[in-house]
Interface confidence: medium
Amino acid sequence: AELFLIASPSHPTEGSPVTLTCKMPFLQSSDAQFQFCFFRDTRALGPGWSSSPKLQIAAMWKEDTGSYWCEAQTMASKVLRSRRSQINVHRVPVADVSLETQPPGGQVMEGDRLVLICSVAMGTGDITFLWYKGAVGLNLQSKTQRSLTAEYEIPSVRESDAEQYYCVAENGYGPSPSGLVSITVRIPVSRPILMLRAPRAQAAVEDVLELHCEALRGSPPILYWFYHEDITLGSRSAPSGGGASFNLSLTEEHSGNYSCEANNGLGAQRSEAVTLNFTVPTGARSNHLTS
């Protein structure tokens, strides 16, 4: 009696199941009690000897490529051996690599967590994912895993993380890069500093006083509000960041506390108060302002 090994499918793709069947065309396995064993190269597979002429392999991988055969043994201990069958496991090259961010859109608050998710639409086996920062490509990290997605995490985003990123996937057929993704790090404003600028050391009534408010950190645009005591004098915008100024024509009523507030939609911060006093110097006829 002759024995044949049949693999179904005969050209499996990585990750897919394969059924090995030990066939005896001129002998019904019911005619005699047979035990079956399947081999790859020199190693027995699965449970070893079994009464089933089939062996189900849940997932085949590239390294499972090899020469397979089966043996059948009767109760009388006669062993039949099939001819070897070469099974080549097919690897699908990676294709359509994309990079996505969490949070979506690539906008993240300073100090928050950023995840760069690299995905492939196609590809089997061990896929190496690599993440790069900047168009020049500083290699951040690599991961090799049997999945179509992998993640690179920045637990606490800093201002210096604002850059373009891309990822590359590779499973042996050459690297496939994703497109560039821009990351914007949104920074809440720091506490602003209020400075008073007068045309001379001792400003007089009717002089123009410049109130300059500046938050040293914070994502633009920044809106600045100016206050005398708790009365709003007005607002100024700094579309590209930096500070903003508000001009005031001085009168005697302008003595008191001044402050400013910076707001960029990620939180507001108020400056320390600056006090202005009108003084009358000895022998002088006009009022002067000191801060």
Partner: antibody, heavy 117, light 112 residues
Framework: QVQLVQSGAELVKPGASVKVSCKAS????????MHWVKQAPGQGLEWIGR????????KYNEKFKSKATLTVDKSTSTAYMELSSLRSEDTAVYYC??????????WGQGTLVTVSS | DIVMTQSPDSLAVSLGERATMNCKSS????????????LAWYQQKPGQSPKLLIY???TRESGVPDRFSGSGSGTDFTLTISSLQAEDVAIYYC????????FGQGTKVEIK
């Protein structure tokens, strides 16, 4: 431009070992797997094995498993192949080659290893 | 291993004429999952390294003249040089990369 520059020809005695180098430039070394191919005098091409420069993981043709050892030095973008227990039948030109789109798109100039007493 | 067999072993063609060579694999190199044939063609001139001409059986490598074309699917493949030039004198190898790479024995192209 992409270049793979191999070390010079070697004349070695039977039983000795030799280490062939392949310096890559013009591309990101860790992104492309490096393969090695043998060509005996007047013969065809024979695949030896490959290495992933990123992880250092390698795979070999069964025939060369006890003959060749593949390594990389990421800091210098250099791949190495060490051939051991050399015999006359190991006399050949050895090529390093980069793989892209499955195929070997760039090749080194080849290193002739001559085994003779 | 997948065995690659090339024919003919050598080929003499007049300048400007068509040169055709074949490559047969012991197993199919076409996979339904991505409809790709895992086959490449290389040119090797005397004293030089091999040069990639064609990959995925029919995709021409950049910089390769369009007189070179690859065709075929499954187990039978063809490399055609539509109009042979003097600089095309070389040995041409096919290679499969469905499994660990194996090469054909080569076809030598000469001028008649």
């Amino acid at each position: 431009q992409v270049q793979l520059v191999q070390s010079g020809a070697e004349l070695v005695k039977p039983g000795a070992s030799v280490k062939v180098s392949c310096k890559a430039s013009g591309y990101t070394f860790t992104r492309y797997w490096m393969h090695w191919v043998k060509q005996a005098p007047g013969q065809g091409l024979e695949w030896i094995g490959r290495i992933d420069p990123n992880s250092g993981g390698s795979k070999y043709n069964e025939k060369f498993k006890s003959k060749a050892t593949l390594t990389v030095d990421k800091s210098t973008s250099t791949a190495y192949m060490e051939l051991s227990s050399l015999r006359s039948e190991d006399t050949a030109v050895y090529y390093c080659t980069r793989v892209n789109s499955g195929a070997m798109d760039y090749w080194g100039q080849g290193t002739l290893v001559t085994v003779s007493s | 291993d997948i065995v690659m067999t090339q024919s003919p072993d050598s080929l003499a063609v007049s300048l400007g004429e068509r040169a055709t060579m074949n490559c047969k694999s012991s197993q199919s190199l076409l996979y339904s999952s991505n409809q790709k044939n895992y086959l490449a063609w290389y040119q090797q001139k005397p004293g030089q390294s091999p040069k990639l001409l064609i990959y995925w059986a029919s995709t021409r490598e950049s910089g390769v003249p369009d007189r070179f074309s690859g065709s075929g699917s499954g187990t039978d493949f063809t490399l055609t040089i539509s109009s042979l030039q003097a600089e095309d004198v070389a040995i041409y190898y096919c290679q499969q990369y469905s499994n660990y790479p194996t090469f054909g024995q080569g076809t030598k192209v000469e001028i008649k």
